[in-house]
Amino acid sequence: ITRQSLDPQRRAAPQQKRSSPTEGLCPPGHHISEDSRECISCKYGQDYSTHWNDFLFCLRCTKCDSGEVEVNSCTTTRNTVCQCEEGTFREEDSPEICRKCRTGCPRGMVKVKDCTPWSDIECVHKESGTKHTGEVPAVEKTVTTSPGTPASPCS
């Protein structure tokens, strides 16, 4: 575990430049010690902190669930990024589950957009070009999310 003094002059190092003059905060990748005198580094691959903080503990790294792929591993300053696997997508309104993409468009409609980890296929009426959104079956899978953060970002 690496420790870093809370001395403001030590904090002036370029990679840990303060974003506010408030004392008693530790930089991303660290949490504060119990006596508030030191910043203790998070454990790489286990936990993290993303911003200046006075956390007693770093946040646990998200573990990608089955049905997801890890696109970025957890570092001490950034949580894991999990993405729905091919053929499934995560909707904004229900980010906790990856849903199966539709396999095709209803009769009289044409596909204008493929399935991505962030969206279902998009179908429009051949003549009018009006969009169609159908019911999407849920995959029986829950996404593990990290407390305090939105369900794993999909970028």
């Epitope: 504060i32 902190s49 646990r60 305090g148």
Partner: nanobody, 124 residues
Framework: EVQLVESGGGLVQAGGSLRLSCAAS????????MGWFRQAPGKEREFVAA????????YYVDSVKGRFTISRDNAKNTVYLQMNSLKPEDTAVYYC?????????????????WGKGTLVTVSS
Amino acid sequence: EVQLVESGGGLVQAGGSLRLSCAASGRTFSNYAMGWFRQAPGKEREFVAALNWSGGSTYYVDSVKGRFTISRDNAKNTVYLQMNSLKPEDTAVYYCAAAGSFSLGGRPYGDDYWGKGTLVTVSS
């Protein structure tokens, strides 16, 4: 989402011991830091103790150091507060809380979940 239910409170004489339990439902219990807080009649809620998601790191407020021990069993989705050498001033409703982390002052970070509390009364 996590639901928390405390138990183990009761009436005990000064110098006695109690073990509080906080049972959590929800598969993400082990992602959360857990804390114990207390509120004495007519007083503000006070941060007592906390531990991180793995149980490897703990924090205690000065007034309970050496007397209280916080621990967790992630397999049982339960966090405990072992209270020894109890004093009349420990009398309060004890609440358990789950959050991503806690600040030095006990402020929860991220989504936080709270139990309804269990009453501890220490008679002199």
